[in-house]
């Protein structure tokens, strides 16, 4: 039961996280005009990964896409790439994890397959979350660098006559959404990996193996050892994950009537 809960919760948390990563990637407010200690303007500028916007106090908002690919800063391209990779990995992870959910039965899919899929999706979520956190952090670092550079030469003289005020940009809402979403996806991935350990069928010290003694039909149950020569091995070729605590909702696979030596 605990495994199912952990897996389910991991899935939900990751789902929310990936939705957040998608939202952050699409948001226009990655950087917003710094209003603190600045000449107050009747125009508010903000920028996203895909377009920059201007909101006038009249309420009129105009957004312009970055229609150039080569003219954009390499850092912006890198952030875009990281976010897209994060979304793609997260989406694949979600797809895989749906089939891996213990509460969903798909044909005769075995626990080992579900465990594998759970681990795969968990790793995908972790990488997805890390991509999002990295992308947002790179952008934030870029903002901080530019902020202090523009603060250093806040007022640039034009011919020594006219002063032009440089617009400074600070963290936008999308950065916080991205950080939180990336964190959630990461946590969800870790939860899936933890659930995977519990899902995996574990070898036991007590495996029923039938022995045919000559003249007698006696069943002998060896105990207290784990054979490395085939005795007590996983008869159905299931992958073994050691150290996973077994729960009551796990079905232990015992040798069948065909498992004769």
């Amino acid at each position: 039961m605990a495994v199912t809960a952990c897996q389910g919760l991991g899935f939900v948390v990751s789902l929310i996280g990936i939705a957040g990563i998608i939202a952050a990637t699409c948001m226009d407010q990655w950087s917003t005009q710094d209003l603190y200690n600045n000449p107050v303007t009747a125009v508010f500028n903000y920028q996203g990964l895909w377009r920059s916007c201007v909101r006038e106090s009249s309420g009129f908002t105009e957004c312009r896409g970055y229609f150039t690919l080569l003219g954009l800063p390499a850092m912006l391209q890198a952030v875009r790439a990281l976010m897209i990779v994060g979304i793609v990995l997260g989406a694949i992870g979600l797809l895989v994890s749906i089939f891996a959910l213990k509460c969903i039965r798909i044909g005769s899919m075995e626990d080992s397959a579900k465990a594998n899929m759970t681990l795969t999706s968990g790793i995908m979520f972790i990488v997805s979350g890390l991509c999002a956190i990295a992308g947002v952090s790179v952008f934030a670092n870029m903002l901080v660098t530019n902020f202090w550079m523009s603060t250093a030469n806040m007022y640039t003289g034009m011919g020594g006559m006219v002063q032009t005020v440089q617009t400074r940009y600070t963290f936008g809402a999308a950065l916080f959404v991205g950080w939180v979403a990336g964190g959630l996806t990461l946590i969800g991935g870790v939860m899936m990996c933890i659930a995977c350990r519990g899902l995996a069928p574990e070898e036991t010290n007590y495996k029923a193996v039938s022995y045919h003694a000559s003249g007698h039909s006696v069943a002998y149950k060896p105990g207290g050892f784990k054979a490395s020569t085939g005795f007590g091995s996983n008869t159905k070729n299931k992958k073994i994950y050691d150290g996973g605590a077994r729960t009551e909702d796990e079905v232990q696979s015992y040798p069948s009537k065909h498992d004769y030596v």
Epitope: P39, T41, A42, V43, V54, E56, S57, S58, Q163, T164
Partner: antibody, heavy 117, light 113 residues
Amino acid sequence: QVQLVQSGAEVVKPGASVKVSCKASGYTFTNWVHWVIQAPGQGLEWMGEINPTNARSNYNEKFKKRVTMTLDRSTSTVYMELSSLRSEDTAVYFCAGIYYGNSFAHWGQGTLVTVSS
Amino acid sequence: DIVMTQSPDSLAVSLGERATINCKSSQSLLNAGNQKNYLTWYQQKPGQPPKLLIYWSSTRESGVPDRFSGSGSGTDFTLTISSLQAEDVAVYHCQNNYYYPLTFGGGTKLEIK
């Protein structure tokens, strides 16, 4: 058709207050409404603005201590109150509706306020 | 505050001739975000409120005759009336619509020569 209709002319004594109204009709009462003063034979001077959506206002530092802008959403009316009036406050007061480029496309007819003892 | 300096203070032009009014701001009114200049031109006739002619330094308001045109960027702007008509006699104001407080130029009185 957009119309901003202002209250009539006022004659007030020095030190008193005056409250000028500006009623909007055919105008989306969500965008900032501005107030502009024009002294006789002088240029235009921006006094401040009020946002009918949230009643937030911005004032010109020159008038900040004496001006108060309020609104009545039920009647789509904006008010501008100027206190501690002096003779130099004798002017025409205009309300204006904001437009693209933060420009003032719609203006009230103006209210002449005369400060005289 | 942003200082808007209009020149000349008054201008006399013959009917059908070109009239040019200049406006200079103490700081750039160009917004980098949308590459628009937040400068507006108004026409004011005696006893009337100002009338919007041009916004974003060069965009003509609907209903304004095409003889009115605006140009300039950053700190230097110009209002041009290509062929002066009798009804164009008025005071013309430029306005900074970018920085608070929003400020106006002193006005240019246009008359017929």
